[in-house]
Amino acid sequence: HTAAQDNCTCPTNKMTVCSPDGPGGRCQCRALGSGVAVDCSTLTSECLLLKARMSAPKNARTLVRPNEHALVDNDGLYDPDCDPEGRFKARQCNQTSVCWCVNSVGVRRTDKGDLSLRCDELVRTHHILIDLRHRPTAGAFNHSDLDAELRRLFRERYRLHPKFVAAVHYEQPTIQIELRQNTSQKAAGDVDIGDAAYYFERDVKGESLFQGRGGLDLRVRGEPLQVERTLIYYLDEIPPKFSMKRLT
């Protein structure tokens, strides 16, 4: 839970307050909104970032439905409850005692209920499909060059191991990045695919969460790759539970 001692900032999360009050006078950074100490050598969890971002505009995330089990986030931003490790609590409630269950990326996966609603476990989002449309270019990007560049980006910028980048699909102008990470595959210290996808989403919108690093400058063989829209699909290890009423 430390950052650079020299200027005491958090390289991986600008939405923090840092001071040299850690052990031995080391820099310690706490997330805005929650006050939770964060590890500045890796990505901060999406729950803590959302909590810190409550002053940001609504509808920051748009979701679509790739199949019958995919989730649509119609609820916009909310002030989440995070557990001591910074993960979303399985049950989220608003100030009017309306409650619902969420998955590991904080998207609602049940109908809304009251305080009696039970959410037994935090269901893991194990498959994320990032759907991008790039701005027109002189010609199509070479698929293998694009694949390599995106895998490099997720490795070097978000510290996500390439084994979790299942595939990169390309049909100009649409790029799809598939991230897969089952509970059994995620070892201690591994970046969560949900956190990597969230950082990437903010980066392509020009809202980088990194401190001091430049914004995202994606290039494929020197040609700029400029994203004009992003859609993210989330699939959970256990399908969501919505009533038929919601589906009509």
Partner: antibody
């Protein structure tokens, strides 16, 4: 026990191409590790050259990038280094190593092979 | 690129001494730092990764600490087998991998 073994010519002429191969045993080259080359000029420190992942993703030291190619041969469980346009400054002990983690630290090393660039 | 600077360049010590080697990064690298031991004519050997995690099979007299820009390798009680050259290496995600210039630990 993971073992790495470098092989290749010990003498290369200036402006020529240095070619080395690293045979891996005790681990599959298709495992989720990185396969790196590191060099050490006589009496000097260590310099990372570059690395490859089994899928073909490569990462190179920017100072050498224009001259380096690292490739992988999954069928032979080995990976290779090519460094072209060599000069006397490329004379060094060349090590292959297995990189662990998302960005590599090196948990297994070959014993090294000395390459001299001289006419 | 991130520069890694080790100090001292040479260290003279006796068996049983407690010794500390310092490694400084030119910018914050979190805890993405490894330490290696190298003996003449041999390949480097991993001692510590992620600043303070001891590699399997490495004696517990070796320990690492630090984060951000300043790191230390400590040998709590020097053994005859420990006289060697020690290197630090950063593996931060936004920079090519770089090593320190080395610290030679010699018998006093």
């Amino acid at each position: 026990q993971v073992q790495l073994q470098e092989s290749g010519p010990g003498l290369v002429k200036p402006s020529g191409t240095l070619s080395l191969t690293c045979a891996v045993s005790g681990d599959s080259i298709s495992s989720h590790n990185w396969w790196s080359w590191v060099r050490q000029p006589p009496g000097k420190g260590l310099e990372w050259i570059g690395e490859i992942y089994h899928s073909g993703i490569t990462s190179y030291n920017p100072s050498l990038k224009s001259r380096v190619t690292i490739s992988v041969d999954k069928s032979k469980n080995q990976f290779s280094l090519k460094l072209n346009s060599v000069t006397a400054a490329d004379t060094a002990m060349y090590y292959c190593a297995r990189g662990s983690g998302v960005i590599s630290y090196f948990d297994y090393w070959g014993q090294g092979t000395l390459v001299t660039v001289s006419s | 690129d991130i520069q890694m600077t080790q100090s001292p360049s040479t260290l003279s010590a006796s068996v049983g001494d407690r010794v500390t080697i310092t490694c400084r990064a030119s910018q914050s690298i979190g805890n993405w730092l490894a330490w290696y031991q190298q003996k003449p004519g041999k390949a480097p050997k991993l001692l510590i990764y992620k600043a303070s995690s001891l590699e399997s099979g490495v004696p517990s007299r070796f320990s690492g600490s630090g984060s951000g820009t300043e790191f230390t390798l400590t040998i709590s009680s020097l053994q005859p087998d420990d006289f060697a050259t020690y290197y630090c290496q950063q593996y931060d995600s936004y920079s090519p991998i770089t090593f320190g210039q080395g610290t030679r630990l010699e018998i006093k």
